[in-house]
């Protein structure tokens, strides 16, 4: 049988006796887009009519009177079997049972879905004594229903080590469809099929589905949620959301912007961060990137000499973390750098150029054609050399480093001069005699000390010997030229 | 002026999922770079990963397999979801924003996570 | 990964004092270095960029230097409001990744 009550109701007997009712539902407004009717009703479905016996699970007592009389089996009696009501609105549902005196603390536990209630929840047991029976209602009270109350509620109580369970009590809790999945944002290549998904649940069963592009409806008749919109391809970003609809009324879901994946903007903002002889530093804002991400970046660089060929050289990097430190540069250069980043559409144009410039360097090479000989008259040696090739001073010469080292029966000392840079030859006192005198050069501009020429030897014999002969830098493949005078 | 806030459980299971939203106002996060920081107890700061102005994201490739960010501009909040933690996710999550000139100029406040079972 | 050693985790310093604060990257990483200051109970604040470049706002006290792999942070005239942890973070290469912390101890 159904029985349905408005929310106004009395509640009304559960069994003979003057015991309270079994339902009471308030009176909370609905929070959902109202039905035309002037109240929501609350449907009470019993499975069998009251007062008829249980045949769930009944506990039947071993003891007797004094007359030996077996007791009665225990059982909760009927009560209503399904509740039906709006979100937010308030409940009371209840349980009762009559138990002999003769039982002493009786307790009455509540279980919803097979879960022990326990705490924060109103529920009140009530004891009405008589003669020889007791009858107990426990009622179960919400004030204000959600969607994670429903399900089956049921009563438990212990006699003699024997379980008795009532039979269950379903609160359905409707109201406005409530999304379990919505659409995501997404971005898209042009002209791409692709599909969004949405999906809503009740109670009540079913729910709707309508899908709205840029305000407008895109499905004439609804689709049982869930629902897959498959958007054949876009050419402009476009808005979609879904609506769902059940009995209650509809719920919209958010609104997600589907975005069409484009080549990058070209980065802005290239920096100069740091500059070396040889290399430079740069930094970039990167530029919008189409809806997708960036693979890699390009770096390019032409000289910006304008007698330089124009070629340009290309250095490629990944696209974090927005920085490239630009290597093998030329001293004492000009160069434009420009850059450009890749997503999966395609590069993006060429960032405005910039001019960077390299500093002064070291020397790259030594100077060539050392050569050492040893005039006897001045007791000095001279050296003479050729300066290292403009392109490979990395900066203007400023002069030149000489290292001499005297080696003499086990005692070797090691003395550096400076010269300028005008000329390319210097001449240097003879520090001990009957000795091996080792000599370097090296150039040098302000940005350092470039690299030391190979050593050339002269051998300077004891006081009075007068043949002698230069010492150079030896050609290649020859180590260690010692001329012996 | 711009600011960070984060926001999100304090306790969180091992095994489970964390998630954590950052609420952005002062700025708009469909400009710029948006990212997470954390910082273990030991002191010692690990860069996450990050989303951009048109949602693209990067991750430390040593949470690549774990970690989603993910946004949503009508609430102007970005979020950060790290799959089965462990104890070693304890921490306290930074969200912060990148500047151009390459720093993160504003940062959170921190929320500090524990995972234990 | 680029990976930013902070050898000394405490340090300790009088109020007038200048204490300088180091930070050791495993590779290059060019001048592509910040430093943060973090309170106790705040998060962390920007005071140096690109290894040198001070952030607005921040007192001249406090000066950065280095390029490479070897970098240090520098407090002249330390304050009692400077008591903080001091972390460095490189940003030549993603990840970005930071240094272990030094906490500057007033005495």
């Known amino acids: 049988a159904i029985t349905e009550a408005r929310e106004e109701a009395k509640p009304y007997p559960l069994f003979p006796g003057p015991f309270p009712g079994s339902l009471q539902t308030d009176h909370t407004p609905l929070l959902s887009l109202p039905h035309a009717s002037g109240y929501q009703p609350a449907l009470m479905f019993s499975p069998t009519q009251p007062g008829r016996p249980h045949t769930g699970n009944v506990a039947i007592p071993q003891v007797t009177s004094v007359e030996s009389k077996p007791l009665p089996p225990l059982a909760f009696k009927h009560t209503v079997g399904h509740i039906i009501l709006s979100e937010h609105k308030g409940v009371k549902f209840n349980c009762s049972i009559s138990v002999p005196n003769i039982y002493q603390d009786t307790t009455i536990s509540w279980w919803k879905d097979g879960k022990e209630l326990l705490g924060a929840h109103h529920a009140i047991t009530q004891f009405y004594p008589d003669d020889e029976v007791t009858a107990i209602i426990a009622s179960f009270s919400i004030t204000s229903v959600q969607r994670s109350d429903n399900g089956s509620y049921i009563c438990k109580m212990k006699i003699n080590n024997e379980e008795i369970v009532s039979d269950p009590i379903y609160i359905e809790v409707q109201g406005l469809p409530h999304f379990t999945k919505q659409p995501e944002s997404m971005n898209v290549t042009r002209n791409t099929a692709f599909n969004l998904t949405c999906q809503a649940v009740g109670p009540p069963e079913p729910v709707n589905i309508f899908w709205v592009q840029n305000s407008s409806r895109v499905n004439e008749q609804p689709e049982k949620s869930p629902s897959v919109l498959t958007v054949p391809g876009l050419t402009e970003m476009a808005v979609f959301s879904c609506e769902a609809h059940n009995d209650k009324g509809l719920t919209v879901s958010k609104g997600v912007q589907i975005n069409i994946k484009a080549i990058p903007s070209p980065p802005t903002e290239v920096s100069i961060r740091n500059s070396t002889a040889h290399s430079i530093l740069i930094s970039w804002v990167p530029g919008f990137d189409g809806y997708s991400p960036f693979r890699n970046c390009s770096i390019q660089v032409k000289e910006a000499d304008p007698l330089s060929n124009g070629s340009v050289m290309i250095f490629n990097t990944s696209a974090l973390p927005h920085l490239y430190q630009i290597k093998q540069l030329q001293a004492l250069a000009n160069y434009s750098i420009g850059v450009s980043c890749m997503n999966e559409i395609g590069w993006s144009a060429v960032s405005p150029w910039i001019l960077a410039s390299t500093t002064e360097g070291a020397p790259s090479v030594a100077p060539l054609n050392v050569t050492v000989f040893l005039n006897e008259s001045s007791d000095n040696v001279d050296i003479r050399w050729m300066k290292p090739p403009t392109k490979q001073q990395d900066g203007e010469l400023v002069g030149y480093r000489i290292s001499h080292v005297w080696q003499s029966a086990g005692i070797s000392k090691e003395l550096l001069e400076e010269v300028g840079q005008n000329g390319s030859r210097a001449r240097i006192s003879v520090q001990v005699h009957n000795a091996t005198c080792t000599v370097r050069i090296a150039a040098v501009t302000r940005g350092g000390v470039g690299p030391f020429s190979d050593p050339v030897k002269i051998f300077i014999p004891a006081h009075g010997w007068v043949d002698y002969a230069p010492s150079s830098t030896p050609a290649p493949g020859n180590a260690d030229p010692v001329l012996i005078i | 002026e711009v600011q960070l806030q984060e926001s999100g459980p304090s306790l969180v299971k091992p095994s489970q999922t964390l998630s954590l939203t950052c609420s952005v106002t002062?700025?708009?996060?469909?400009?710029?770079?948006w990212n997470w920081i954390r910082k273990f107890p030991g002191n010692k700061l690990e860069y996450m990963g990050y989303?951009?102005?048109?949602?693209?994201?990067n991750y430390n490739p040593s949470l690549k397999s774990r970690i989603s960010i993910t946004r949503d501009t009508s609430k102007n909040q970005y979020y950060l979801q790290l799959n089965s933690v462990t104890t070693e996710d304890t921490a306290t999550y930074y969200c912060?924003?990148?500047?151009?000139?390459?720093?993160?100029?504003?940062w959170g406040q921190g929320t500090t996570l524990t995972v234990s079972s | 990964d680029s990976v930013m050693t902070q050898s000394h985790k405490f340090m300790s310093t009088l109020v007038g004092d200048r204490v300088s604060i180091t930070c050791k990257a495993s590779?290059?990483?060019?001048?592509?270095v910040a430093w943060y200051q973090q309170k106790p109970g705040q998060s962390p604040k920007v005071l140096i960029y690109?290894?040198?470049t001070r952030h607005t706002g921040v007192p001249d006290r406090f000066t950065g230097s280095g390029s490479g792999t070897d970098f240090t942070l520098t407090i002249t005239n330390v304050q009692s409001e400077d008591l903080a942890d001091y972390f460095c973070?490189?940003?030549?290469?993603?990840?970005?990744?930071f240094g272990g912390g030094t906490k500057l101890e007033i005495k």
């Open positions: 002062g700025d708009s996060i469909t400009s710029g770079y």
């Open positions: 989303i951009n102005y048109s949602g693209s994201t």
């Open positions: 973070h490189q940003y030549s290469t993603y990840p970005y990744t």
């Open positions: 690109w290894a040198s």
């Open positions: 590779q290059d990483v060019g001048t592509a």
């Open positions: 912060a924003r990148w500047n151009y000139l390459y720093y993160f100029d504003y």
